[in-house]
């Protein structure tokens, strides 16, 4: 969050809209009359990408000059200035920086520790003073029984068969974010969490290897939740409800094995983990966990460059990558994304200045920092400019961790981007086998929802901006993320075809940018939400007897869904009837499309209390999955079901969907008011 009390030289933010200031990009003698078509642009992009050495840039960004680069550190800043200079060299319409003062958590001089003690609290032996840490852990000392909870998912805790209240929980890294593991453990009254990487899932030779992460169930600076800390807003001190109230610590595999030596019970075979894994501490032993992390205020810089659109400069796609990394390992975590960001910026600058590409809409290239603390830089920018970005920023493309392997191409995105992603996947060839990335007509069913630790998440769930994140990766997690072994050498060893893989990722991102900024009709498939709504209604329908017993009806929800469906059909008809050359009409229609995602943000919750307001992809009781979870409890355990909450959830969900339908319909006189 931003604190505006810096010196005069401080650069003013969010000047994206100030078209009058911008020098248009210098162009060579290029005929401006002939409009380039999609096929030409695709070929042009491909040719440009062929001439680029991505791997060299990634290597350069992974060397000592720029590592380690914890957010706000000197090396993080020097990389920020390098990127800023590069953007200036690309002769962007405008380059600016965004300065924030945020609270991050670092290790204290007093070491964190994990100790085995006897039942009287007497030291048996020190297991480890871990090298890594988990940012935003509670600083505390706790002592208790240690219980293994596999990955720490809700289901893992349900299957555990032993209560964890008053116990410390040990979990494997993977499957869900650290923050979710901790929140799940805390919800069951566990008193602390230890996280380790097992050898089966993370086949790392060095058992002593430490690693880093954060435990904030949210994004942005957790001490200014849902708002930016501009000094003139005078918000009282605040803390995110997503902060844990228990200590959390990462430990090495060697430390975990020492703990297992003092534990009993075989880990279930279906966990598919190391044979050393054990379930609970012996009855004579306890574990004592001490976390002494401290909060520090740090100045962070986000760097931006914009290529202004020629027709609608106030509509923009944002392309971003994380620049920082906790610990010494940076390659896959942030060098790939940052390198790709720089090269895409260079290519698009080139296409405009040398080849006559004229994007209708603007392209903002963004280098975020404090990503390792939970997309802090990106979220603070969103929090600061939410009103400015509304109906202006229409897509976010995330470049983080785009290459972690070669086997799979995975996508996480807003449904609005499914159709476009599908077309691009059909167009782009995998560099290893030469086949198209589109392997399965059922690919959409395999799309995973954006997780908290993805910078695209706050764009979608907080700001209601369609967002996409993709990667070339393996079925197994990339083992070195968050460790000092996340080096360029390790990455090239895991991905020998690194240059080709990053080039292909650049082609996917590049095609997305072109399609989103060049086509007259906005490439956001609003009809995709029809199937999302249908799926939700189907899930809800299974409980219609329960709903009827409560004296409620689903009729109004069906009606709202029907209205949304009709609104999408009407908009499709309007697009079909519109004169494509009539910019005014097309802009009006595109504006209706841009409203879709935003109007799925629940208007009934406060962005301060529930920042992730999106009813499909957000987090909190206002979401459609939360409504279903609550309703499920009615059958399972009547005591846990909250009927008052459900009545509210159903009413507000219905009205949110109705509101989205109305917004899509256009002007108030076009809305069917027979609801």
């Amino acid at each position: 969050c931003k604190r505006v009390e810096q010196k005069e030289e401080c650069v003013k933010l969010a000047e994206t809209e100030e078209t009058d200031k911008s020098e248009t990009m210098e162009t060579e003698d290029v005929p401006t009359s002939s409009r380039l078509y999609w096929a030409d642009l695709k070929t042009l992009l491909s040719e440009k990408l062929n001439s680029i050495e991505f791997a060299d840039t990634i290597k350069q960004l992974s060397q000592n000059t720029y590592t380690p680069r914890e957010a706000g550190s000197q090396k993080d800043e020097s990389l920020a200035y390098y990127i800023e200079n590069q953007f200036h060299e690309f002769k962007f319409s405008k380059v600016w920086r965004d300065e924030h003062y945020v609270k991050i958590q670092v290790k204290d001089s007093a070491q964190n520790s994990v100790i085995i003690v006897d039942k009287n609290g007497r030291l048996v032996y020190l297991v480890e003073n871990p090298g890594g840490y988990v940012a935003y852990s509670k600083a505390a000392t706790v002592t208790g029984k240690l219980v293994h909870a596999n990955f720490g998912t809700k289901k893992d805790f349900e299957d555990l068969y032993t209560p964890v209240n008053g116990s410390i929980v040990i979990v494997r890294a993977g499957k869900i974010t650290f923050a979710e593991k901790v929140a799940n453990a805390e919800s069951l009254n566990a008193i602390g969490v230890l996280i380790y990487m097992d050898q089966t899932k993370f086949p790392i030779v060095n058992a002593e290897l430490s690693f880093f992460g954060h435990a904030h169930l949210g994004t942005g600076d957790p001490y200014t939740p849902g708002f930016p800390s501009f000094n003139h807003t005078q918000f009282p001190p605040s803390r995110s409800s997503g902060l844990p109230n228990i200590p959390v610590q990462t430990i090495s595999r060697a430390a975990a094995e020492k703990l297992f030596g003092n534990m009993e019970g075989d880990c279930p075979s279906d966990w598919k983990t190391d044979s050393t894994c054990r379930m609970v501490t012996s009855e004579s032993k306890n574990v004592k966990l001490t976390v002494s992390n401290v909060l520090k205020e740090r100045r962070i810089l986000n760097i931006f460059g914009v290529i202004k659109g020629y027709e609608e400069p106030d509509r923009y796609v944002v392309v971003g990558a994380q620049r920082d990394a906790l610990g010494a390992g940076v390659a896959a975590k942030s060098s790939v994304g940052t390198g790709l960001l720089l090269k895409l910026a260079q290519v698009f600058s080139d296409m405009i200045s040398k080849d006559g590409f004229r994007p209708s809409r603007s392209i903002i290239f963004a280098s975020w920092t404090a990503g390792d603390f939970g997309a802090v830089g990106a979220t603070e920018w969103l929090e600061g400019y939410l009103s400015s970005l509304h109906l202006k920023a229409f897509t976010y493309i995330n470049l983080d961790k785009v290459v972690l392997g070669t086997s799979n191409f995975k996508v996480s995105a807003s449904p609005l981007l499914y159709t476009l992603m599908g077309k691009i996947m059909q167009d782009v060839k995998h560099p290893v086998d030469g086949k198209s990335l589109y392997r399965d007509s059922n690919w959409i069913s395999k799309v995973e929802k954006l997780s908290f630790d993805n910078a695209a998440y706050p764009f979608l769930a907080y700001s209601g901006i369609p967002a996409v994140s993709f990667c070339f990766c393996e079925d197994a997690d990339y083992p070195y993320l968050g460790t000092r072994l996340d080096t360029y050498e390790a990455l090239t060893q895991k991905v020998p075809q690194l240059n080709q893989m990053v080039r292909t990722a650049a082609e996917v991102a590049g095609q997305l940018i072109i399609k989103l900024t060049h086509d007259v009709e906005l490439n956001l498939d609003y009809e995709r939400y029809n199937s999302q709504l249908l799926s939700f209604v189907r899930d809800l329908n299974q409980y219609r007897a329960d709903i009827k017993e409560m004296g409620l009806s689903l009729q109004w929800l069906y009606s709202a869904r029907g209205d949304f469906f009709r609104a999408t059909s009407r908009l499709t008809t309007d697009f079909g009837n519109a004169e494509k050359t009539d910019r005014f009409v097309m802009k009006k229609l595109n504006d209706r499309v841009m409203r879709v995602e935003y109007h799925f943000l629940s208007p009934y919750v406060s962005p301060k209390e529930s920042p992730f307001r999106h009813v499909f992809w957000g987090s909190g009781s206002h979401t459609l999955p939360a409504l279903l979870e609550n309703l499920k409890l009615r059958k399972q355990n009547n005591g846990a079901f909250n009927e008052t909450l459900f009545r509210n959830q159903l009413a507000l969900a219905t009205w949110t969907i109705q509101g989205a339908a109305n917004a899509l319909s256009g002007d108030v006189w076009d809305i069917d008011n027979e609801f």
């Epitope: 068969y161 032993t162 009993e264 019970g265 075989d266 279930p268 379930m279 012996s282 009855e283 004579s284």
Partner: antibody, heavy 122, light 109 residues
């Protein structure tokens, strides 16, 4: 209802073999360590063997080591005791018993079967 | 292996009286790893106490356990008619083999 039912006992000659089974129901069998305990007629309890919930760890009383083998089939919720080279002093009622807490290997036994009698006689 | 010696061998008491049963180990046993069982004729044993002093589920509070190291005690504060039975202590703290005491019979005087 949590229940353990032992079967397989009977008359066997010295040097012979017998396989006891213990069928478990009413609880998550794969989460509990299981024990075999025996009691010779008119005598006290003698601990025989233990097997961890997943079958990874096993231990035996010195008197049966090398002759008896404990095993389990978690898919069938069944515990076994393979007894070879039986001796007269092995004659007893054999109980299977469940650990009192899930996962723990070293703990008391809170659920017991009714026992099955093994008679070793020529 | 650890040998557990229970005393007395037989305890003759009347209902309502207090019973104190002793279990002595040949070497130190962690208090976390000592249990007491009750067995009536023709029945399987029943867990009373684990961890030297924690009552098992459903066990009345007239039963209590105490002790550490090599000396452990089971106390029945007021004997009820159904409490007359044989009582065994068991240690499971050292590396196996785990052992039972020879038993103490509590009989009606």
């Amino acid at each position: 209802e949590v229940q353990l039912v032992e079967t397989g006992g009977g008359l066997v000659q010295p040097g012979g073999s017998l396989r006891l089974s213990c069928a478990a129901s009413g609880f998550s069998f794969d989460k509990y360590t299981m024990n075999w305990v025996r009691q010779a007629p008119g005598k006290g309890l003698e601990w025989v063997s233990v097997i961890s919930n997943g079958g990874v760890s096993t231990d035996y009383a010195d008197s049966v080591k090398g002759r008896f083998t404990v095993s389990r089939d978690n898919s069938k919720n069944t515990l076994y005791l393979q007894m070879n080279s039986l001796r007269a002093e092995d004659m007893a009622t054999y109980y299977c018993a469940r650990a009192s807490q899930p996962w723990l290997y070293r703990t008391g036994a809170d659920v017991w079967g009714q026992g099955t009698m093994v008679t070793v006689s020529s | 292996e650890i040998v557990l010696t229970q005393s007395p061998g037989t305890l003759s008491l009347s209902p309502g009286e207090r019973a104190t049963l002793s279990c002595r180990a040949s070497q130190s046993v962690s208090s976390s790893y000592l249990a007491w069982y009750q067995q009536k004729p023709g029945q399987a044993p029943r867990l009373l106490i684990y961890g030297a002093s924690s009552r098992a589920t459903g066990i009345p509070d007239r039963f209590s356990g105490s002790g550490s190291g090599t000396d452990f005690t089971l106390t029945i504060s007021r004997l009820e008619p159904e409490d007359f039975a044989v009582y065994y202590c068991q240690q499971y703290g050292s590396s196996p083999p785990w052992t039972f005491g020879q038993g103490t019979k509590v009989e009606i005087k």
